[in-house]
Interface confidence: medium
């Protein structure tokens, strides 16, 4: 399969995750016990395929309005990815463009 044109990769993926997840932080992969297709990780889901905001939200470290699964801490991220957002460095326009793309 070829990668679709509307995808999120690299820094844009991190930026968008930070925008979507806010202070909750995020995972780059999900425990296999969760929905099985998520075990591929967000890179495969969003960089190599199109993903939407709802899917991005599933990679946030704490579910927005449901109980947190404390038995599975966030996956250790590569150290070139910020684990949590650094609010004052946000480039809101970039993330707004990315999330608008995902809504389309």
């Amino acid at each position: 399969a070829y990668r679709p044109s509307e995808t999120l990769c690299g820094g844009e993926l991190v930026d968008t995750l930070q925008f979507v997840c806010g202070d909750r932080g995020f995972y780059f992969s999900r425990p296999a016990s969760r929905v099985s297709r998520r075990s591929r990780g967000i890179v495969e889901e969003c960089c190599f395929r199109s993903c939407d905001l709802a899917l991005l939200e599933t990679y946030c470290a704490t579910p927005a309005k449901s109980e947190r699964d404390v038995s599975t801490p966030p996956t250790v991220l590569p150290d070139n990815f910020p684990r949590y957002p650094v609010g004052k460095f946000f480039q809101y326009d970039t993330w707004k463009q990315s999330t608008q793309r995902l809504r389309r």
Partner: antibody, heavy 119, light 107 residues
Amino acid sequence: EVQLLESGGGLVQPGGSLRLSCAASGFTFSEYVMWWVRQAPGKGLEWVSVISPSGGYTVYADSVKGRFTISRDNSKNTLYLQMNSLRAEDTAVYYCARDRGGATTLDYWGQGTLVTVSS
Amino acid sequence: DIQMTQSPSTLSASVGDRVTITCRASQTISSWLAWYQQKPGKAPKLMIYKAASLGSEVPSRFSGSGSGTEFTLTISSLQPEDFSTYYCQQYKTYPVTFGQGTRLEIK
């Protein structure tokens, strides 16, 4: 220790084919995005192709699209690059490299294998 | 695609010198920039990522700075083993792109 070892390079005539392999060890191969990057003699780095961890998704540079095919066998910890319809401008050292975090930076590279396209 | 332009193409310096290499992006890439070092006949080595973070086992004399469209790699006191070619790479999004390289040679 992470190791990437390319093989399969050599001399081929224009229009010919070659298949490069990259044997990976020292890490969980199936979890990483993998790349092929090339470097023509005396020139800079050019990314060629990228493949997702599962092998289900691929990306190609415009210069090789339709001629090269990247693939992987996670059971064998091996990355491949099938090169068809080779041209003189494909002459380069071809490196396989591990993506550090997903469409980002390349933290481990193989030693490279030279592909020479000439009549 | 985002174009990356390095300057200078060649830089002559002496052991102990402080040197700076510049990389410019054709559009803003935030801090999503890496620097690689390549010695003749060898594979590139990741030196700096996220514009300013030091790669694994990279000496502290190397540093990176910048954001947006302009970035610099600085070597505070050149050592003999630092004479190499350096490449910048943006990874804000696909396709990632490399600069054309800066060759650091002995004066």
